[in-house]
Every structure is written in C-alpha cells, then in structure tokens.
C-alpha cells in the first residue's frame, strides 16, 4: 500500500495473507468459514511452492494469539483467467479446515448486486504489499482509503486505454494506491467487499494508471458454485 498507514490491529478480521513457503505473496479475503478469495495470478508466482493462508494476523512476523496458518485443500482459479490478461483475475482457496472464527477472524460480506459503485465513493484497501517505490515491505498490515474512479476515465488512452471491462472497477492512484504484494486483497466499500486487487505488473502511485480491481458482484454465480 502506497501512501497509506498502519491499520488498526485486527480491525479487518477478514484479511488474509496468502503465503508460499512461509513468505507473504498476496492478499486475500475470507468470504466463508473455509474459503479465501484472492487473485488468480498469485498462483502463477507460487510455482511449486507450498501455498498456505494466514488468518488473524496484524504483524507477519510477531506472535499473536489470533494468528493461524492454514494449509490449502484446493485452489480454484477462475476458469477463464489467463496469464497474459487481468480478466477474471479471481482465485478461491479452500482451507484444509474451517477457520476458527473470533473477533480477529471473520468472513466479510461480499457484494452480490451487479451494479457499479458510485464514482467518488471512498473505499478501503488493505494489504502487506510494498509501501515504497524502493520495494520496502511492511511487517504490519497497511490500509488506505481510495475514491472509486468512473470506468470511462479509467479507459482513456492516457490511463488504461480500453482495458477496463464491465467486470472491473478502478480507484484513484494519485500517490495513494495498492501495489505489489497487495494483489488478491479486498477493496471494501461501506463494509462490503466490492473488489479484489488485480495482480498485473502495474505502476503504482501514478494518477494516470489507476488501480484495477475485479468486481466480485460480477462473479457471484461462479463464487456461489465453487462454495456450494
């Protein structure tokens, strides 16, 4: 997260760290007791490493009573996701067992009504992604509030030049932005999960390259079918 600040500890109990061989790789969001939603491209970076999900964490390194690392029973990328595009960049991870819920571990309601968030709405994005252009990684969860940007502006030639489909949404990126390592994390508007950070190699913090988020409402049928 660029231009953000440290989150209040455990105030986002849905927040997950998707890890490979014990290292943070991507964000994720607990959407059901046994399921974490993340970005499909995160799996590509995992290679053949052991994928696990950390729940109940604020610090990645310090012991915390609520922290627990779960093995992944099944990884389900969206069937239409492709390595060369950010389309359908969603991944569902089934935990090896149901998460132990509590004040620091709790699923987040996700948007099912397929309607665009009003541009200008301030939404919260959180993650353990880099906090500087130099690539500094935080130990503790960061977050930032970002205004939603209308799709027409996001699709301008100076911005994402037509790449933003109806199944994506954008948020402003003027110095405050999601960045590398935040992919798969939640964009939360009004207490509801609206978007998932896409995992392209986008420049961060440049106002002409807004953050791109996969709209979960557009994938309600797929999410429901996997969780069923």
């Amino acid at each position: 997260i660029l231009g953000g600040r440290e989150a209040e500890a455990h105030a986002r109990p849905y927040m997950a760290s998707v890890q490979v061989n014990g290292e943070h790789l991507c964000g994720g969001v607990l959407v059901a007791e046994q399921w974490v939603l993340s970005a499909a491209h995160c799996l590509e970076d995992a290679a053949d490493g052991k994928v696990q999900v950390l729940l109940g964490a604020h610090s990645l390194s310090q012991p915390e009573p609520s922290k627990r690392l779960y093995d992944v029973l099944r990884a389900v990328p969206h069937p239409d996701s492709r390595p060369d595009t950010i389309d359908h960049d969603l991944l569902l991870l089934q935990l090896s067992e149901k998460a132990t819920l509590g004040p620091a571990v709790r699923p987040l309601p996700w948007q099912r009504v397929d309607r665009d968030v009003e541009p200008g709405t301030l939404c919260d994005v959180a993650g353990w992604g880099i906090v500087s252009h130099a690539g500094r990684r935080p130990d503790r969860l960061q977050h930032v509030l970002l205004p939603v940007l209308d799709r027409a502006t996001c699709n301008r030639r100076t911005h994402h030049d037509g790449a933003i489909t109806q199944r994506m949404m954008c948020a402003e990126s003027n110095r405050r932005d999601s960045c590398k390592g935040d992919s798969g994390g939640p964009l939360v508007c009004g207490g509801v999960l609206e978007g998932v950070v896409t995992s392209g190699s986008r420049v961060c913090g440049n106002r002409k390259k807004p953050g791109i988020y996969t709209r979960v409402a557009s994938y309600a049928a797929w999410i429901d079918s996997v969780l069923a």
Partner: antibody, heavy 115, light 107 residues
Framework: EVQLVQSGAEVKKPGASVKVSCKAS????????MYWVRQAPGQGLEWIGE????????NFNEKFKSRATLTVDTSTSTAYLELSSLRSEDTAVYYC????????WGQGTLVTVSS | DIQMTQSPSSLSASVGDRVTITCKAS??????VAWFQQKPGKAPKGLIR???SRYSGVPSRFSGSGSGTDFTLTISSLQPEDFATYYC?????????FGQGTKVEIK
C-alpha cells in the same frame, strides 16, 4: 462489432444551429469517453471536445467552447454535438470517435454552411 | 495549445520504399501520441497509440517511436494501399491537437 453511426449530411444557413448524432453499438456506451473532431474541405483534423457519457462531464477546445454543446442519451447510446451561430468556416465533415481501446470513428457527417 | 509540427507535408515514394514521417511537439507530451491514416472520403484509421504500440490488425510494417517532443512513424516497405495522408495526434494535454498531415503519394 463496435460501430459508431452518424446522422446524415446537413445544409444550414449562417447563424443557424446544427445537431449531429453519433449512435454507438457493440460496447458499453458509458465506459468510454466520446470525442468530436472536424475536418474542413482539404484541411487537417481539428479536435472540438469530448464528453464522459457516464457523468456528462465535458472538455472543450477553447475555440469552440462558446458555440459547441456536447450531450449524450445513455438510453439510446447516442452522443450529440450541437454547434450554434454557424458561419461558412464551419463547413466541414464532423466525426465522433471513441476515446480508449481500439480507435473507432464514425463515418463522418458533412455540414455545409451556405447562404 | 501544444503544436504538433509534422514533416514533410508531402512526399513521393515508390512501392517497397522505406518512409519516415516525423512529428515534433512544442512541449513534452511523454508518449501520449497516436498516428492515424486517412484515405480520401474516409474516416481516419488508428495505426499507433502510446507512440509505439500498434493497434490490432495494423500490419507490422508500420512502427512508431519517440517520447517527449520527437516522434516518428515509419513504414518499412511501402505497399500500394499505404498511399494516404498520415496525422499525428497528442492526447497528453487539452486541447488534443493534430499535426497538419503528411500526404504520401506515388512517385
């Protein structure tokens, strides 16, 4: 298939107004700005302005700001350019074009201003 | 306004020739430059965006380069269908502006 289909040719008298339409199909109309360009006979291309169909926000070339009005009807996915106080120098082909992604242009509308 | 000065204004060339058209911006426009091809009585057709990215379906003989203030469109081997007028456009700043055009004619 994306298409921008413009209204037919117009002949107007000096001082009159003209309204050119541009009907979009094959994509989500509100997801892309629409801009307008004109080309006088034998001349180059001149940018008039643009509109965000989602918000209605417009940006104009200062040269046209006082005389040009850009509007949209999202229910029919149509963009409009209205040019008032026409003079003979406004005789030109007027084009709409989608801003972003592939460079889609309308076929052009010839507006002739003659007394 | 940003002036886009295109040169030459016209050129004569033969099929198979390598053709280079240049466009100079009066101030820095990063890589926010597009190139269009226009044939008589037709709407302009996009060739290049972001100074060097070809639009899909555009033959590889068309290439663009440059950043800042100096931009080039190159046709590596001119084909009969390439005889047309070419325009550069900057979209970095309002108002968007075009070069005055380069007419490529048959020698």
């Amino acid at each position: 298939e994306v298409q921008l289909v413009q209204s037919g040719a117009e002949v107007k008298k000096p001082g009159a107004s003209v309204k050119v339409s541009c009907k979009a199909s094959g994509y989500t109309f509100t997801s892309y700005y629409m801009y307008w360009v004109r080309q006088a006979p034998g001349q180059g291309l001149e940018w008039i302005g643009e509109i965000n169909p989602y918000s209605g926000e417009t940006n104009f070339n200062e040269k046209f700001k006082s005389r040009a009005t850009l509007t949209v009807d999202t229910s029919t996915s149509t963009a409009y350019l209205e040019l008032s106080s026409l003079r003979s120098e406004d005789t030109a082909v007027y084009y709409c074009a989608r801003e972003g992604g592939f460079a889609y242009w309308g076929q052009g509308t010839l507006v002739t201003v003659s007394s | 306004d940003i002036q886009m000065t295109q040169s030459p204004s016209s050129l004569s060339a033969s099929v198979g020739d390598r053709v280079t058209i240049t466009c100079k911006a009066s101030q820095n426009v990063d890589t926010d430059v597009a190139w269009f091809q226009q044939k008589p009585g037709k709407a302009p057709k996009g060739l290049i965006r972001s100074a060097s990215s070809r639009y899909s379906g555009v033959p590889s003989r068309f290439s663009g380069s440059g950043s800042g203030t100096d931009f080039t469109l190159t046709i590596s081997s001119l084909q009969p269908e390439d005889f047309a007028t070419y325009y550069c456009q900057q979209y970095n700043n309002y108002p968007l502006t075009f070069g005055q055009g380069t007419k490529v004619e048959i020698k």
